[in-house]
Amino acid sequence: AWITAPVALREGEDLSKKNPIAKIHSDLAEERGLKITYKYTGKGITEPPFGIFVFNKDTGELNVTSILDREETPFFLLTGYALDARGNNVEKPLELRIKVLDINDNEPVFTQDVFVGSVEELSAAHTLVMKINATDADEPNTLNSKISYRIVSLEPAYPPVFYLNKDTGEIYTTSVTLDREEHSSYTLTVEARDGNGEVTDKPVKQAQVQIRILDVNDNIPVVENKVLEGMVEENQVNVEVTRIKVFDADEIGSDNWLANFTFASGNEGGYFHIETDAQTNEGIVTLIKEVDYEEMKNLDFSVIVANKAAFHKSIRSKYKPTPIPIKVKVKNVKEGIHFKSSVISIYVSESMDRSSKGQIIGNFQAFDEDTGLPAHARYVKLEDRDNWISVDSVTSEIKLAKLPDFESRYVQNGTYTVKIVAISEDYPRKTITGTVLINVEDINDNCPTLIEPVQTICHDAEYVNVTAEDLDGHPNSGPFSFSVIDKPPGMAEKWKIARQESTSVLLQQSEKKLGRSEIQFLISDNQGFSCPEKQVLTLTVCECLHGSGCREAQHDSYVG
């Protein structure tokens, strides 16, 4: 049987005077007269930390050789052996428990040097802000490791806005109202003590706690000026009218600070747009629609200012949306002169006789944009490529300088174009350009004539193409009617119209003879009008060698 007792040793003490701290003994030594030796294994002897204990193999005494540290090894479990001469166990190995008793040799240590937290201003009393934390290496659940927290200092120091639960490290708001606009942050110095928080001269660890006060929208934006004025020039667009300077005590740059404008009245016409400059918190009023001074001399409107963020419940009832009046004067800009229409049409006819030269065919009056009355202006021709007209420099009357000609190369689709410039007599000088479209009525003063009155064809050619033209326009031109005049007699038999197109015919020779013919045509336009002189086609039929053109006719030429 074994003889032993559990052992408890205090850390941090010189334990030599307590040696032997334990002794194992087997009574088999006496009973059987055996030579027994003792041996210990375990932490402190055969396992690290080595050299804590030594034993006497003959007596079984166990001595401690060094000061113990509970925080390093809180418990030693040794195994004792009783061995015979051969080294065999004579007893069942014995467990020896050595408990290391704690002393308060560790102070609390904060888990962070700086703790950071935040809480909204106006938070209710006893709102949990954050939790701080320290640890103590001494034995848990003892006074040695029981931590007590304390606020050492608070900056700003007064009033006391936070309290610290000494046991949990939780920081709460007090009944003092937090106001970010007064103090936007607080710095606390905290300490942690053990041993129930008694103040001793042992060193004490401290930490910093930084608490940021979060903004809420508890301030109403205020406009700098109660009366605002602006000025815009008429006919301008996308110009700044005025800036509304807003002051708001809430956090700069936040939605609680940022002004939000709405039109209260006066912008039903949609002339203005307002947006906030996020840098300056000014409301920028922009004119987005042209204003005519002659219609509106003033544009007064009002705006309401709030914040982008909703108001905090603490001020919601206090906010009264008060319209801010803005008076905008419209500045008259000299608009000078204008043509009521930049293009006018005048109708003339080719049938005008010589007496029509110098006749007034129209005018192109410029008007004053501001008054709407006829303007004092000087009228100048800008473009009149064939000098058809003259313009009275003062009255703008347009006179014919030459008779209209529908067939003129300057007439396009029946229209002759003139450009006239009006220059204001008043200052500032303004030049405007107008276009006069002179629409020329065509008369049937041209008859159809042959385009190619002299032609040569090869004797083996099936047909000859005969084409006419008439300089008149529709309906005084094509389609034409063609007929071969039977002069001399028999000619109409010899030359037959095989096919008729709008302005041409295919002519066929009934008997293929070489030589020259003079074929007379009667060609009438769409109105039945033909030239007084007959249209004669001089046609030479000749022999062509291998496509090389006419060989000199071997026969006498003949007519008809």
Partner: antibody, heavy 118, light 106 residues
Framework: QVKLQESGPELVRPGESVKISCKGS????????MHWVKQSPAKTLEWLGV????????NYNQKFKGKATLTVDKSSSTAYMELARLTSEDSAIYYC???????????WGQGTSVTVSS | DIVMTQSPAIMSASPGEKVTMTCSAS?????MYWYQQKPGSSPRLLIY???NLASGVPVRFSGSGSGTSYSLTISRMEAEDAATYYC?????????FGAGTKLELK
């Protein structure tokens, strides 16, 4: 008193451009139009164009379209004429002239001599 | 373009003598302007709207005409009148000038 002060003489190479200035003083610069006239060595006068300063619109002689460009800087009361792609034909004295009452060219600058030579 | 033809190209007159020079337009014009230019100087407005004297112009100068035919007259020639005289129209763009009449002192 009304004065039109033109920039100094220019000697330029063929193919280059030149910008002549004409500073108006003694009157409301923006109220009037400014004309530009070329006087060739043969002493003939040719109209190049006009700019209505207040309204910033221009009219050019077709012959000089693409050759002359008229601009204005209202803040400095200065009218400009730029001549592009110069040739020896462009060597001349160039005048700016104010368009006054009755549409007459009532005040003229002292002229800027432009010589195009390689 | 309206072509302005001045005649004579060169003329001379004695002090006190009456001087007349003409300007003919290729198309009818409403008004005529006359300018005087002395060597080394810029042109100077003499007459606007055919017959009106510009500010500071002596009354011995006068202008007349209509349609295509216009003239400038100096009732009594003075030494300081020796210069080149240009007519100019502005009834049609571009503005055009005559080639000038050079008036010399005899």
């Amino acid at each position: 008193q009304v004065k039109l002060q033109e920039s100094g003489p220019e000697l330029v190479r063929p193919g280059e451009s030149v910008k002549i200035s004409c500073k108006g003083s003694g009157y409301t610069f923006t109220d009037y139009a400014m004309h530009w006239v070329k006087q060739s060595p043969a002493k003939t006068l040719e109209w190049l164009g006009v700019i209505s300063i207040y309204y910033d619109n221009t009219n050019y002689n077709q012959k000089f379209k693409g050759k002359a460009t008229l601009t204005v800087d209202k803040s400095s009361s200065t009218a400009y004429m730029e001549l592009a792609r110069l040739t020896s034909e462009d060597s001349a004295i160039y005048y700016c002239a104010r368009e006054g009452d009755y549409f007459a060219l009532d005040y003229w600058g002292q002229g800027t001599s432009v010589t195009v030579s390689s | 373009d309206i072509v302005m033809t001045q005649s004579p190209a060169i003329m001379s007159a004695s002090p006190g003598e009456k001087v007349t020079m003409t300007c003919s337009a290729s198309s009818s014009v409403s008004y005529m302007y006359w300018y005087q230019q002395k060597p080394g100087s810029s042109p100077r407005l003499l007459i606007y709207d055919t017959s009106n004297l510009a500010s500071g112009v002596p009354v011995r100068f006068s202008g007349s005409g209509s349609g295509t035919s216009y003239s400038l007259t100096i009732s009594r020639m003075e030494a300081e009148d020796a210069a080149t005289y240009y007519c100019q129209q502005w009834s049609s763009f571009p503005l055009t000038f005559g080639a000038g009449t050079k008036l010399e002192l005899k």
